[in-house]
């Protein structure tokens, strides 16, 4: 049954509408034409479209689609970008504070070790920062370097203050002795364990956030295929050719088209879900020795304890090292005498109380809750885009790609489309190379996150005492495991009050652009009717 002739026998409406898309009227017929050259908007009768108009519609449709996709991901993208920046900055602040605490400990307790100790501490925390940001750094190496560098200074300044300034020649021997004689007990091993565990998790957390940004950016800038462009054109613009300017596509039809166009993108869904759930598991496990904030801000105390351990054993050590490094020394220097009362009985030690006001862990949990609301982001994309573009409600009196229908029938629409375009073919093509690449990256990070995430009842945690020491790290001599702080120690209060230093606000409710219209560029706005405001995120 032939469709009714265009309401406007002169194509006037079509001309004025098309002019907004493309200034100039040379492509628009003045009166309906047979349209035998059309390839997308196949006419059943006279048409107000030309081949050139069709091409312009296809281009516009693809631009519309790209813009809708970007609007859909805006809030999610802003959430992850904002948080990645905030956490990176926060981690740097933690490192800076940990360095300052450690330097203050040296200044207050061992002024004779400065400025050398400041240099070694600086080197250590520089490596910590570099490691977190993904540099090729080995944690054991940086801890070894710290203690290798510290011991010669401790020996020459604290244990043997009679040594001349130019003690570089015995440094070599002292560095060797540090490891051979385990002069710091098991403290270096303890620090290695705590620092490596906490930093590994921190590094992967940041890596995961940055990959999240990459995923969104990839899908945000997808270029849609010509096949998709044809389907979109048929849905959004072919009705114009028949002079049906105000008709909206059927909702069901829009969903079919979007699923076809986004078949590749939707394949990300499975890995995206896994990404958010794995990230949640990682975050849930980031406490005690898996929490860099907790570990790094307590390092000054452990380093202080390690020096006390050396001092406690100064007598034995000086004699042994005197023999061991005799060839490096011109003479034996007197050993410094340390009165017994310098050593605090472990039983009376009180662990410095840490008050948590607002910590990084609460920020992390908040982020996970927000991310979980986007867990269905990719599977819901087709539906979201349809709900944010003009579609007819209840599928009544709507455009099905060929004609105006009273009620949309998917079967009829599919049959009618067979000759024009094979929707099934589009779905079978598989994702674009960029989508495949991002899926591979997601698989990789998910694997890393799973490796890092321990089961809920981690065996390791049961072996940790209150100070977070691993059992087995302390030898028979309990003094190796002094966990408290001597005189002049800093009290670590309001652990992350310094989050206030962050210039960011994590609240994304007023994210820039959240109220923008999901429309094409200004000169194309009117062709798209009213796409509606992007009020809510795609959840």
């Amino acid at each position: 049954q032939p469709p009714p002739p265009p309401p406007d026998a002169t194509c006037h409406q079509v001309r004025s509408f098309f002019q907004r898309l493309q200034p100039g009227l040379k492509w628009v017929p003045e009166t309906p034409v047979p349209g035998s050259d059309l390839q997308v908007c196949l006419p059943k009768g006279p048409t107000c479209c030309s081949r050139k108009m069709e091409e312009k519609y296809q281009l516009t449709a693809r631009l519309n689609m790209e813009q809708l996709l970007q609007s859909a991901s805006m809030e999610l993208k802003f959430l992850i970008i904002q948080n990645a920046a905030v956490f990176q900055e926060a981690f740097e602040i933690v490192v800076r504070h940990a360095k300052n605490y450690t330097n203050a400990m040296f200044k207050n307790n061992y002024p004779s070790l400065t400025p050398q100790a400041f240099e070694f501490v600086g080197e250590f925390f520089t490596d910590v920062s570099l490691y977190i940001l993904g540099s090729d750094i080995n944690v054991d190496d940086m801890v070894n370097e710290l203690f290798d560098s510290l011991f010669p200074v401790i020996y020459t300044q604290l244990m043997n203050p009679g040594l001349p300034d130019s003690a570089l020649d015995i440094n070599e021997c002292l560095r060797g002795a540090r490891r051979d004689l385990k002069v710091f007990g098991n403290f270096p091993k303890l620090i290695m364990t705590q620092v490596s565990k906490s930093l590994q998790v921190t590094r992967i957390f940041l890596q995961a956030l940055n990959l999240g940004i990459e995923v969104i950016n990839t899908t945000d800038h997808l270029k849609f295929s010509k096949d998709c462009g044809r389907m979109l054109t048929r849905m959004w613009y072919c009705s114009y050719c028949q002079g049906l300017m105000m008709v909206k596509p059927c909702g069901g039809y829009c969903n079919v088209v979007m699923q076809g166009c986004m078949a590749g993108v939707v394949e990300i869904d499975k890995y995206w879900r896994e990404y958010i759930l794995s990230l949640e598991e990682l975050v849930n496990g980031m406490y005690r020795i898996y929490d860099m904030e907790n570990v790094l801000l307590g390092l000054f105390s452990t380093i202080h304890d390690s020096i006390q351990y050396v001092q406690k054993n100064a007598g034995k050590l000086t004699t042994t090292i005197g023999k061991l490094c005799a060839h490096s020394q011109q003479r034996q220097y007197r050993s410094a005498y340390y009165p017994e009362d310098l050593f605090i009985d472990k039983k009376v030690l009180k662990v410095a109380h840490v008050e948590h006001e607002e910590t990084l862990s609460s920020r992390r949990r908040e982020l996970i809750q927000k991310l979980k609301s986007f867990i269905s982001f990719y599977s819901a994309l087709p539906g979201y885009i349809c709900s944010h573009s003009p579609v007819a409600e209840n599928d009544t009196l709507c455009w099905n790609g060929q004609e105006l229908v009273e009620r949309y029938s998917q079967k009829a629409a599919r049959n009618g489309m067979k000759n024009q375009f094979n929707l099934h073919e589009l779905k079978m093509k598989g994702p674009e190379p960029v989508v495949s690449q991002i899926i591979d990256k997601l698989k990789h990070i998910n694997q890393l996150l799973r490796t890092m995430s321990m089961p809920k009842g981690r065996v390791l945690d049961k072996n940790l005492d209150e100070e977070g020491f691993e059992s087995g790290d302390c030898g028979d001599d309990e003094d190796e495991c002094i966990g408290g702080s001597g005189d002049g120690m800093i009290k670590v209060k309001n652990q992350l009050r310094f989050l206030a230093e962050l210039a960011y606000d994590l609240d994304v409710d007023d994210a820039p652009g959240n109220s923008q219209q999901a429309t094409p560029k200004d000169n194309e706005i009117s062709t798209f009717h009213n796409l509606g405001n992007v009020h809510s995120p795609l959840k």
Epitope: F118, E119, T126, S135, I137, D141, R175
Partner: antibody, heavy 116, light 110 residues
Framework: EVQLLESGGGLVQPGGSLRLSCAAS????????MSWVRQAPGKGLEWVSA????????YYADSVKGRFTISRDNSKNTLYLQMNSLRAEDTAVYYC?????????WGQGTMVTVSS | SYELTQPPSASGTPGQRVTISCSGG????????VNWFRQLPGTAPKLLVY???QRPSGVPDRFSGSKSGTSASLAIGGLQSDDEADYYC???????????FGGGTKVTVL
């Protein structure tokens, strides 16, 4: 006595590759971070790269990142610098030095000339 | 361009005291220690002063280093003819995560 001896320098065309070696003796090589520092003709010193004692951590100046690779073989007491995609501006005497932040001992250097 | 600034040249007569300055910023000299090297023509640099003011054994006490704020200086007392060389300062830079050198100062004994 600490000794560092560089080798492997020479003339190479732009885009070419060279591998420098530094043989160390007189100290426990594996206990020390090591660096490469270069000096263009008539110019000052410029740090190029560093590596930790075990070789687990590596560091590079921005000017060579992605082109140069530092490595070490502690069993042979030798430090290496693999230089790829060489440019005219890489022309310099390359010194190996002990340390990462401050350099207490230096080798005599090996000259690398990048020219067509 | 060098991150640390040194005067290109300095000179003095034998027996005189010469001071070389090295000026940086808060991310290098301001927060890390300074080391000084001497490079005789055609030879490798040699460490003169480390940790701002420490001398390795074998370096005469005519050489002394000091640091204040974001500047450091090397003083050579009782200048001798074999002190003619290029002198370099170096400090770690926290922003660049790398050691930075001064451009070098050529000391001439008149």
């Amino acid at each position: 006595e600490v000794q560092l001896l560089e080798s492997g320098g020479g003339l190479v065309q732009p885009g070419g590759s060279l591998r420098l070696s530094c043989a160390a003796s007189g100290f426990t090589f594996s206990s020390y971070a090591m660096s490469w520092v270069r000096q263009a003709p008539g110019k000052g010193l410029e740090w190029v790269s560093a590596i930790s004692g075990s070789g687990g951590s590596t560091y590079y100046a921005d000017s060579v990142k992605g082109r140069f690779t530092i490595s070490r073989d502690n069993s042979k007491n030798t430090l290496y610098l693999q230089m790829n995609s060489l440019r005219a501006e890489d022309t310099a005497v390359y010194y190996c030095a002990r340390g990462k932040r401050y350099f207490d001992y230096w080798g005599q250097g090996t000259m690398v000339t990048v020219s067509s | 361009s060098y991150e640390l600034t040194q005067p290109p040249s300095a000179s003095g007569t034998p027996g005189q005291r010469v001071t070389i300055s090295c000026s940086g910023g808060s991310s290098n000299i301001g927060s890390n220690t300074v080391n000084w090297f001497r490079q005789l023509p055609g030879t490798a640099p040699k460490l003169l002063v480390y940790f701002n003011n420490q001398r390795p054994s074998g370096v005469p006490d005519r050489f002394s280093g000091s640091k204040s704020g974001t500047s450091a200086s090397l003083a050579i007392g009782g200048l001798q003819s074999d002190d003619e060389a290029d002198y370099y300062c170096v400090a770690w830079d926290d922003s660049l995560n790398a050691p930075v050198f001064g451009g070098g100062t050529k000391v001439t004994v008149l």
